[in-house]
């Protein structure tokens, strides 16, 4: 299953499959997730080691048993790959690292006014993988405001150095935020020239294209079909690059297919997995296990659940079958692709779905009438769980926020439905940033069921929580995916990085905002909160957040939206925007429904019809 816990001051011994430099443990974990054989990782922050060569070292590890012995190492951070973790799987990494210079091949330098502008330039450059920016206070005046665009053979820095007044980060192309745009077309009977960066075997051009998209240096590809004239080159997928970023030439060639990486696509990237099953095809590789199962789909599920399995072949040969079950061969290789692809067989083959963003689970948990005042504009994909609950009567308007917690579930505030309990009048918009982008053609979700907490009473602040079941499940993308829920009764975690988002009023007597707003607000203890609200009962099922001096808060139109906190690199839904005295007033914190206190209720209500809780437990 999915394991998200990080181990502080611990280092996994042995099992090394690759090593690289990464700026933090989260980026190291992401590289582990996307490495075909990595199950575990260990990271050495600069503070944890004197050896300059090992600082920022990220060590990717494999283990037949799925675990390795942990040794104590002060400052080290270790953890698991996020394979099998559904919507948490993403190659997108937005963080900017202050005081750090990520080294690589510098291929472009320009003057810019901010690190954000530098990151934008990197994201809009086809070859840029990461960047460094010298701030205005950099010690050498001639380098100030320099934006260095960089790449490296592996897509990670060749070295990372601690350097004052330098800020570094990665391209946001994997966040589907590139302005370059992409070529979706593939070209039949055409071969591209230029430099081959890798060679893998794939069953079709679309798998080849997805592998190219997630390979750090692939810009385009050529695939040789299974009827290519040279037998030894059939099903070969050549991943390619060039200095210019485009093929310098192409040759008409029967039975070849060429195309481009989709990394520069805006708004949608292909999932980093291959879900199609190929009948009449055998995938060769190292044998991991052989099991008897009923049907090729069960074989694929078995492969997906066995974390080391990369691909499989389900044999229909009479000697491989008994009764209704046949042999399911679970296999792996060094690069995650079959070492041999054979056609005309009595089998069906396919890949593990361990890197698919869309698990079957409906709700994500972890084991362990109120715009935002004083906020700033959010950017695309920053809060992909945020939804807008809108009512269509004669006109259509935004009324509340909400949080996507599963393919078919939204969590919001009960008071959003005061006087509007009819599910037909509601439209739920997900994956949006600007309300003005909504037109009559914008897709929306309709409500199948509104589940208001049984103890909620209109115009009371208690139990202000409601679940919405959508009529149809949503697909997950970089701009539309769920927020994880806290564990039941989560009281031990100290959250220090919490944000509230919404399109609500920017002042008490304001109006709904166009661009989704965000504000960083500290949590306030319930005792402190109770002092500020002497006329109300602040229960343990509420959580408060705000600045003593006011100025930043949720407001009308933010109700039902999320209060999220980042802990160990993972966002969790800590609160649901509920109520407060005015907006952003001094010593009047916002009051939020404490999600951890309602976990039993959420789990009970989101259970599937067959009685299984549709929950994902990444830890």
């Amino acid at each position: 299953g999915c394991l998200t816990q990080l181990y502080e001051n611990a280092f996994f011994r042995g099992g090394d499959v690759a090593s690289m430099y990464t700026p933090n443990a989260q980026y190291c974990q992401m590289r582990c997730t996307f490495h075909p054989r990595c199950l575990l990782f260990s990271f050495l922050p600069a503070s944890s080691i004197n050896d300059m060569e090992k600082r920022f070292g990220c060590f990717l590890k494999d283990s037949v048993t799925g675990t390795l012995p942990k040794v104590h190492r002060t400052g080290a951070v270790s953890g698991h790959s996020l394979k099998q973790c559904g919507h948490q799987i993403s190659a997108c990494h937005r963080d900017i690292y202050k005081g750090v210079d990520m080294r690589g091949v510098n291929f472009n330098v320009s003057k810019v006014s901010s690190v954000e502008e530098c990151q934008k330039r990197c994201t809009s450059n086809i070859r840029c993988q990461f960047f460094s920016y010298a701030t205005q206070t950099f010690h050498k005046a001639e380098y100030r405001n320099n934006c260095l665009l960089k790449y490296s053979p592996g897509g990670t820095p060749t070295a990372i150095k601690v350097l004052s007044n330098v800020e570094s980060g990665f391209s946001l192309k994997p966040c589907a935020l590139s302005e370059i745009g992409c070529h979706m077309n593939i070209f039949q009977h055409l071969a591209f020239s230029d430099v081959d960066v890798a060679r893998v075997l794939t069953p079709d051009a679309f798998v080849c294209r997805t592998i190219c998209t997630y390979h750090p240096n692939c810009l385009f590809f050529t695939f040789y079909t299974n009827v290519w004239k040279i037998e030894s080159q059939r099903n070969v997928c050549l991943l390619k690059t060039s200095e210019s970023g485009t093929p310098s030439s192409s040759t008409p060639q029967e039975n070849t297919i060429s195309g481009y990486s989709l990394l520069t696509c805006k708004r949608t990237l292909p999932e980093p997995c291959h879900s199609k099953i190929y009948p009449g095809v055998d995938f060769g590789g190292e044998e991991l296990n052989v099991t008897f199962v009923k049907g090729v789909n069960v074989c694929q599920e078995t492969c997906t659940k066995m974390i080391r399995c990369q691909f499989f072949t389900y044999s229909l040969l009479p000697e491989d079958c008994k009764e209704e079950k046949c042999k399911c061969f679970l296999r792996l290789s060094m690069d995650g692709s079959p070492t041999r692809i054979a056609y005309g067989t009595q089998g069906s083959s396919g890949y593990s779905l361990r890197l698919c963003n869309t698990g079957d689970n409906s709700v994500c948990t972890t084991k362990t009438s109120t715009r935002i005042v004083g906020g700033t504009n959010s950017s695309w994909g920053e809060w992909p769980w945020q939804v807008s609950l809108q009512v269509k009567l004669t006109a259509q308007r935004h009324l509340c926020g909400g949080s996507l917690i599963g393919h078919q579930w939204v969590l919001t505030a009960a008071h959003c439905f005061d006087g509007l309990p009819l599910q037909d009048v509601w439209r739920i918009y997900s994956g949006i940033l600007n309300l003005s982008d909504i037109t009559k053609d914008t897709p929306f979700s309709q409500i199948k069921e509104i589940i208001i907490h049984q103890n909620y009473k209109v115009s009371e602040g208690n139990h202000d929580i409601a679940l919405i079941k959508l009529q149809a499940p949503l697909n997950y993308t970089e701009f539309q995916k769920p927020i994880c829920l806290p564990s039941k009764g989560d009281t031990s975690t100290i959250y220090t990085n919490c944000w509230v988002t919404g399109w609500g009023f920017s002042k008490e007597k304001g109006e709904i905002q166009n661009i989704l707003q965000k504000v960083n607000i500290p949590l306030v203890t319930n005792e402190e909160c109770q002092k500020r609200y002497q006329d109300y009962k602040i229960t343990q099922r509420m959580v408060c957040a705000g600045y003593k001096e006011g100025g930043k808060d949720a407001c009308k139109g933010d109700s039902g939206g999320p209060l999220v906190c980042k802990h160990n690199g993972m966002w969790r839904l800590v609160g649901i925007t509920s109520w407060g005295e005015g907006c952003a007033r001094r010593e009047q914190p916002g009051v939020y429904t404490k999600v951890a206190e309602y976990m039993d209720w959420i789990l009970e209500k989101t259970q599937s019809s067959d009685g299984k809780a549709q929950m994902q437990s990444p830890a």
Epitope: D204, F206, N226, I257, S275, P279, G280, G347, T358, N475
Partner: antibody
Framework: EVQLLESGGGLVQPGGSLRLSCAAS????????MIWVRQAPGKGLEWVSV????????MYADSVKGRFTISRDNSKNTLYLQMNSLRAEDTAVYYC?????????????WGQGTMVTVSS | DIQMTQSPSSLSASVGDRVIITCRAS??????LNWYQQKPGKAPNLLIF???TLQSGVPSRFSGSGSGTDFTLTISDLQPEDFATYYC?????????FGQGTNLEMK
């Protein structure tokens, strides 16, 4: 020239049998997935059956399972559809088509179709 | 089985118009979606495969987009020869189902 040519259609009584053939030319028949698709008068396209290159893997629509058998003779470059226990609802134009290689399993080459009428 | 739902089922348009036909799959099919054109008494003709790639010989006024469950076929500048029935078809998993068709007729 790449071509598919169906034959064997005609009028048959309910419960009867018919064997359709599809002769391929102009391409390496043995390397391609082949399918049968049918179209009832005035209706849409309905996928009937598929056979993968060696003939080892075949699949059928639920509506014909147990009654129809797809096969191929790679040495003769010919695709077959054996239709038994025919019913009135099997009345349609039957097309054979070739699956694309290495791309989307789309059907890029189609025959002109052969009419099957099941009536008493 | 994966169900394919096309809309609209029929459509009236004039030469020069821009026409959009949509196709929705009952579950995600990645980009394994193909579009065909069929004229009365003729076999279907492949227009687009893999959701967006034009089959060779097909005019560039035809384009396709989408991934996952929602797909569109766009004809940007309708020509007299484009009046026909259009079908989407998924090639993600057997049975390789077709949509019910969209009949494009002259207004």
């Amino acid at each position: 020239e790449v071509q598919l040519l169906e034959s064997g259609g005609g009028l048959v009584q309910p419960g009867g049998s018919l064997r359709l053939s599809c002769a391929a030319s102009g391409f390496t028949f043995s390397a391609y997935m082949m399918i049968w698709v049918r179209q009832a008068p005035g209706k849409g396209l309905e996928w009937v059956s598929v056979i993968y290159p060696s003939g080892g893997v075949t699949m059928y629509a639920d509506s014909v399972k147990g009654r129809f058998t797809i096969s191929r003779d790679n040495s003769k470059n010919t695709l077959y559809l054996q239709m038994n226990s025919l019913r009135a609802e099997d009345t349609a134009v039957y097309y054979c088509a070739r699956g694309t290689v290495g791309a989307s399993d789309a059907f890029d080459i189609w025959g002109q179709g052969t009419m099957v009428t099941v009536s008493s | 089985d994966i169900q394919m739902t096309q809309s609209p089922s029929s459509l009236s348009a004039s030469v020069g118009d821009r026409v959009i036909i949509t196709c929705r799959a009952s579950r995600s099919i990645a980009t394994y979606l193909n579009w065909y054109q069929q004229k009365p008494g003729k076999a279907p003709n492949l227009l687009i495969f893999g959701a967006s790639t034009l089959q060779s010989g097909v005019p560039s006024r035809f384009s396709g987009s989408g991934s996952g469950t929602d797909f569109t076929l766009t004809i940007s500048d309708l020509q007299p020869e484009d009046f026909a029935t259009y079908y989407c078809q998924q090639s993600f998993s057997d049975p390789y189902t077709f949509g019910q068709g969209t009949n494009l007729e002259m207004k």
